[in-house]
């Protein structure tokens, strides 16, 4: 239904707290360099204006669209051109072009310092002094670093943060209470960020149809007892929610997500038997819980997929009558039978099925042609299964750090032109798949591994798009989203690459490395490893292991030495010489 004032409508639906949080996220995601105080001022002005519209929907400007209102606010910021360069040109445009322009200027890799967590005491003090400001800072800092973070989900993580601080700041040992809990939230939020970015990429590059197909597969796996009409309704609603969030319409997105959660809880009987626990929770927790609810039990009496999609004489007729509906039912039926497959794999199978029908239905004897389609799925299924087995075996053998290093070597060989920081970040993230997925039961490994890898590789593609340097990466990133991971896996050593010349300073270290936290130490070592591979792309695993073991020994020795500086300055050059010899 149309509302006289959109801003009043959203304020009423969401309530002041969520309204303010979402406006802050929106501004922080659009203008990523502004300080918290600048954004907080704008948020307060927008909120005060929304309240005047609630009081009188006919008041001046209350009938304007949210894009117009928010865009006007952003464009009124002083020194916009000095701070944001060509983004200021967006302000010369009219809506909806202005908003599109803002979206295009979102930076997936802003040059902001890492979000450092303050020391426990200081955190608790500022939290107690002003919890609202404290949480505002959290929303601002996360949103500006992750301009596509799913806004209603970020409110959920802020709520989690709040609960942890409330609990731990009352403890005697605040540090040991806060650290593991906040680390857990951070890890989940980072995964949520790359997953959502993948959804927005799908929407931006391939449109709503592609996202809806993803949603149908995912929902069919989770709710195998829901009928196709129900799954289609949920997928359509979920597509709308994600389209809004990816498009910067955060108030509409959060409002529609709350509506979807409400609908699901009111229709549990036709959706799933597993929703009740989620539905008993308050809004943010409820929506979060529903998004990762366990799969319902599969119906026992499902007929073989071949009956309707291979053996039926009507296949081509049904396909001709409504291509998208027929392919949608195929995806639904296949997905509900395979919670053990990744969504990417299911979409590849649906694509193969579509290509088979396109070819076979044009033949004189279609059934003879498409009769073998299910057998043709086999290699497509085996490939990711082998990937999971090989990688999980390697992870179990090497542990997370060693596994990350193996991936780093592999990916540096595939795309040595990519910057070392990007390769290290990618390898560290890809390597976490072991800890995240390889410990799961067998039937959950494949969906966990492949869908996580796809999301991480999407980030690799986004970073590479900014400064394309590798033809290998460009090739894999320009295809369809579901083909990316197999494409990257199939890449081998880039034979066109001219090895980097050996620079001693790249492998020269100082005593300051000794005081770094373990994570930072690992990054330094992994940076050196990537540089070694760039110098010798065809070095064997044994050669690289010898060098890295020597390097680790050197760090251990010098960091334990009484005179660290002298140790580093005398032993360092020896290490460099040994490295060159080992790789000769």
């Amino acid at each position: 239904e149309a509302h006289k004032s959109e801003i009043a409508h959203r304020y009423n639906d969401l309530g002041e707290q969520h309204f303010k949080g979402l406006v802050l996220i929106a501004f922080s995601q659009y203008l990523q360099k502004c300080s918290y105080d600048e954004h907080a001022k704008l948020v307060q002005e927008v909120t005060d204006f929304a309240k005047t519209c609630v009081a009188d929907e006919s008041a001046a400007n209350c009938d304007k669209s949210l894009h117009t209102l928010f865009g006007d606010k952003l464009c009124a910021i002083p020194n916009l051109r000095e701070n944001y360069g060509e983004l200021a040109d967006c302000c010369t445009k009219q809506e909806p072009e202005r908003n599109e322009c803002f979206l295009q200027h979102k930076d997936d890799n802003p040059s902001l310092p890492p979000f450092e967590r303050p020391e426990a005491e200081a955190m608790c003090t500022s939290f107690k002094e002003n919890p609202t400001t404290f949480m505002g800072h959290y929303l601002h800092e996360v949103a500006r670093r992750h301009p596509y973070f799913y806004a209603p989900e970020l409110l959920y993580y802020a709520e989690q943060y709040n609960e942890i601080l409330t609990q731990c700041c009352a403890e005697a040992d605040k540090e040991s209470c806060l650290t593991p809990k906040l680390d857990g939230v951070k890890e989940k939020a980072l995964v949520s960020s790359v997953r959502q970015r993948m959804k927005c990429s799908s929407m931006q590059k391939f449109g709503e149809r592609a996202f809806k197909a993803w949603a149908v597969a995912r929902l069919s796996q989770t709710f195998p007892n829901a009928d196709f009409a129900e799954i289609t309704k949920l997928a359509t609603d979920l597509t709308k929610v994600n389209k809004e969030c990816c498009h910067g319409d955060l108030l509409e997105c959060a409002d529609d997500r709350a509506e979807l959660a409400k609908y699901m809880c009111e229709n549990q009987a036709t959706i799933s038997s597993k929703l009740q626990t989620c539905c008993d929770k308050p809004l943010l927790k409820k929506a979060h819980c529903l998004s990762e609810v366990e799969h319902d039990t599969m119906p026992a009496d499902l007929p073989a997929i071949a009956a309707d999609f291979v053996e039926d004489q009507e296949v081509c007729k049904n396909y001709a009558e409504a291509k998208d509906v027929f392919l949608g039912t195929f995806l639904y039926e296949y997905s509900r039978r395979h919670p053990d497959y990744s969504v990417s794999l299911l979409l590849r199978l649906a694509k193969k099925y579509e290509a088979t029908l396109e070819k076979c239905c044009a033949e004189a004897n279609p059934p003879a042609c498409y009769g073998t389609v299910l057998a043709e799925f086999q290699p497509l299924v085996e490939e990711p299964k082998n990937l999971v087995k090989t990688n999980c075996d390697l992870y179990e053998k090497l542990g997370e750090y060693g596994f990350q290093n193996a991936i780093l070597v592999r990916y540096t060989q595939k795309a040595p032109q990519v910057s070392t920081p990007t390769l290290v970040e990618a390898a560290r993230n890809l390597g976490r798949v072991g800890t995240k997925c390889c410990t799961l039961p067998e039937d959950q490994r494949l969906p966990c591994v492949e869908d996580y890898l796809s999301a991480i590789l999407n980030r690799v593609c986004l970073l590479h798009e900014k400064t394309p340097v590798s033809e290998h990466v460009t090739k894999c990133c320009s295809g369809s989203l579901v083909e990316r991971r197999p494409c990257f896996s199939a890449l081998t050593v880039d034979e066109t690459y001219v090895p980097k010349e050996f620079k001693a300073e790249t492998f020269t270290f100082h005593s300051d490395i000794c005081t770094l936290p373990e994570k930072e130490k690992q990054i330094k070592k992994q940076t050196a490893l990537a540089e070694l591979v760039k110098h010798k792309p065809k070095a064997t695993a044994e050669q690289l292991k010898t060098v890295m073991d020597d390097f680790a020994q050197f760090l251990d020795t010098c960091c334990k030495a009484a005179d660290k500086d002298t140790c580093f300055s005398t032993e360092g050059p020896n290490l460099v010489t040994r490295c060159k010899d080992a790789l000769a």
């Epitope: 004489q313 009558e321 239905c361 044009a362 033949e363």
Partner: nanobody, 115 residues
Framework: KVQLVESGGGLVQPGGSLRLSCAAS????????MSWVRQAPGKGPEWVSS????????LYADSVKGRFTISRDNSKNTLYLQMNSLRAEDTAVYYC????????SSQGTLVTVSS
């Protein structure tokens, strides 16, 4: 909505000829193989002939081979069946179908071969 409308049937003497047409709409005609299927009174459906989307490949049931010719005009979205040397056993309702379907989803056209 997919629609198939057959025409051209009628009463013909044994040894005579008829040309059946099937006007198709609601789908990309040239992307689909098409078939003619017939059903004699009190019998089940019987496949007669098929043609690929481009018209380059054709298949015939042994009972009509050498007598019937299937063709199509993709510019007119029309399928044809030229029937020569008709026999009494060719009497049936003839339907055009998409792909390899034997199930009629249209009215069909009646062909009666009788002296």
């Amino acid at each position: 909505k997919v629609q198939l409308v057959e025409s051209g049937g009628g009463l013909v003497q044994p040894g005579g000829s008829l040309r059946l047409s099937c006007a198709a709409s609601g789908f990309t005609f040239s992307s689909f193989g098409m078939s003619w299927v017939r059903q004699a009174p009190g019998k089940g459906p019987e496949w007669v002939s098929s043609i690929s989307g481009s018209g380059s490949d054709t298949l015939y049931a042994d009972s009509v081979k050498g007598r019937f010719t299937i063709s199509r005009d993709n510019s007119k979205n029309t399928l044809y069946l030229q029937m020569n040397s008709l026999r009494a056993e060719d009497t049936a309702v003839y339907y055009c179908t998409i792909g390899g379907s034997l199930r009629a989803s249209s009215q069909g056209t009646l062909v009666t071969v009788s002296s």
